[in-house]
């Protein structure tokens, strides 16, 4: 029962943890403009992994993508793609845990495939975890890096746009949720590990009984196979769970010369 | 008809308050709303900004210590008092409205405030 | 804060003439983020508040007649009335809506000759 419990939380943990990953790298607010003491100026800039974006006091908001990639950065194309590998990782620990699960049957598959597959997906969720994490550590501290530098954009040259005003930029919700996500799904993945452990089936460990025959010497060792190779039919502590899978039903504005939003 | 009303002309002695009063109709009332003033032969001013949603302003740093935003959000009005008032504050008085590119669109009629002893 | 430095002072001109009015800003009012610049121009007639002709150094309002055109980047813009209108006799403001204090010029005057 703790196993299962363990399983499932992980499950659920890890899978917060990766719609957060997701939310995370969509995000715009991963750098904001300081607004330490007083905003310097009437607008405020914000930029995510895909594209800056700027609100004016007016409400409306613009946003435009970086249409380049040659142009951008070698640390941004680092944290997109350990963001991205993030999120495949996750997604395949999920779809495997999925069937890992042991309140879901599949056919008349074993502890033992359930064993290694909760295993499986619990390292992919460790990895997946720990790139978010890596990626988000990394853009930070770029962000540390260039915050002193209040003359000059961290994306200076990018697709041409040269930074003009004194804007410095600071950690944004994305960087936080992206910590927060990641750390959930590292501890998911520790969970899928650590019930992996209690899913193996343990080897019956019957004492070996001789059996002589006349004009024979022959060994048999019953129970001598461990259950993952598929023979013998130990089913006096296996527990059936009938159970099926069960499922669990979130730019550009623009405001009117006469409605300020 | 997107209209700013501002309150009437006002003749103040030096050292006193002047409270001008800018009603908004025929737009929502949401977003920050500027004053501004001119004095006579002179060119506009910013004195600072207030947004009627939550009361948040911004003042210029000239009147940071005698300018007062406030507003009432059941009578879609918005109020700038200035204080300690001295002959140089003679001036018209605007409200206006924020639009694209953080520019004024829409002005108040303008409130002629006189400052003398 | 930005001072907003507009020139000439005034100037008169024949109906139907081209006319130019400069600004230029102690720094530069283009954003990065959006690639705009934060230059207003503001039309200003006697006994009346000023009236909103271009937002973002260029972008005309509606209603504005399209002789009046706005353009440069960075600190420098100017204001092209392509052919001047009796109408058009006003003082002329550009502000600054990047920094904080917002800042204006000091007008040119227009008039016709």
């Known amino acids: 029962m703790a196993v299962t419990a363990c399983q499932g939380l992980g499950f659920v943990v890890s899978l917060i943890g990766i719609a957060g990953i997701i939310a995370a790298t969509c995000m715009d607010q991963w750098s904001t403009q300081d607004l330490y003491n007083n905003p310097v100026t009437a607008v405020f800039n914000y930029q995510g992994l895909w594209r800056s974006c700027v609100r004016e006091s007016s409400g409306f908001t613009e946003c435009r993508g970086y249409f380049t990639l040659l142009g951008l950065p070698a640390m941004l194309q680092a944290v997109r793609a350990l963001m991205i590998v993030g999120i495949v990782l996750g997604a395949i620990g999920l779809l495997v845990s999925i069937f890992a699960l042991k309140c879901i049957r599949i056919g008349s598959m074993e502890d033992s495939a359930k064993a290694n597959m909760t295993l499986t997906s619990g390292i992919m969720f460790i990895v997946s975890g720990l790139c978010a994490i890596a990626g988000v550590s990394v853009f930070a501290n770029m962000l540390v890096t260039n915050f002193w530098m209040s003359t000059a954009n961290m994306y200076t040259g990018m697709g041409g746009m040269v930074q003009t005003v004194q804007t410095r930029y600071t950690f944004g919700a994305a960087l936080f949720v992206g910590w927060v996500a990641g750390g959930l799904t590292l501890i998911g993945g520790v969970m899928m590990c650590i019930a992996c452990r209690g899913l193996a089936p343990e080897e019956t460990n019957y004492k070996a009984v001789s059996y002589h025959a006349s004009g024979h010497s022959v060994a048999y060792k019953p129970g001598g196979f461990k259950a993952s190779t598929g023979f013998g039919s130990n089913t006096k502590n296996k527990k059936i769970y009938d159970g099926g899978a069960r499922t669990e039903d979130e730019v550009q504005s623009y405001p009117s010369k006469h409605d300020y939003v | 008809q997107v209209q700013l009303v501002q309150s009437g002309a006002e003749v103040k002695k030096p050292g006193a308050s002047v409270k001008v009063s800018c009603k908004a109709s025929?737009?929502?009332?949401?977003?920050?709303v500027h004053w501004v003033r001119q004095a006579p032969g002179q060119g506009l001013e910013w004195m600072g900004e207030?947004?009627?949603?939550?009361?948040?302003?911004n003042y210029n740093e000239k009147f940071k210590k005698r300018v007062t935003m406030t507003r009432d959000r059941s009578t879609s009005t918005v109020y700038m008092e200035l204080s300690s008032l001295r002959s140089e504050d003679t001036a018209v008085y605007f409200c206006?409205?924020?639009?694209?590119?953080?520019?004024?669109?829409?002005w108040g009629q303008g409130t002629l405030v006189t400052v003398s002893s | 804060d930005i001072v907003m430095t507009q020139s000439p002072d005034s100037l008169a001109v024949s109906l139907g003439e081209r006319v130019t009015l400069n600004c230029k800003s102690s720094?530069?009012?283009?954003?990065?983020?959006?690639?705009?610049?934060?230059l207003t121009w503001y039309q200003q007639k006697p006994g009346q508040p000023p009236k909103l002709l271009i937002y973002?150094?260029?972008t005309r309002e509606s209603g504005v007649p399209d002789r009046f055109s706005g353009s440069g980047s960075g600190t420098d813009f100017t204001l092209t009335i392509s052919s001047v209108q009796a109408e058009d006799v006003a003082v002329y403001h550009c502000?600054?809506?990047?920094?904080?204090?917002?800042?204006f010029g000091g007008g040119t005057k227009l008039e016709i000759k």
């Open positions: 973002w150094s260029s």
């Open positions: 025929g737009y929502t009332f949401t977003n920050w």
């Open positions: 207030i947004n009627p949603t939550n009361a948040r302003s």
């Open positions: 720094q530069s009012l283009l954003n990065a983020g959006n690639q705009k610049n934060y």
């Open positions: 502000q600054n809506n990047y920094y904080y204090p917002l800042t």
């Open positions: 206006a409205g924020i639009y694209y590119g953080n520019s004024f669109a829409h």
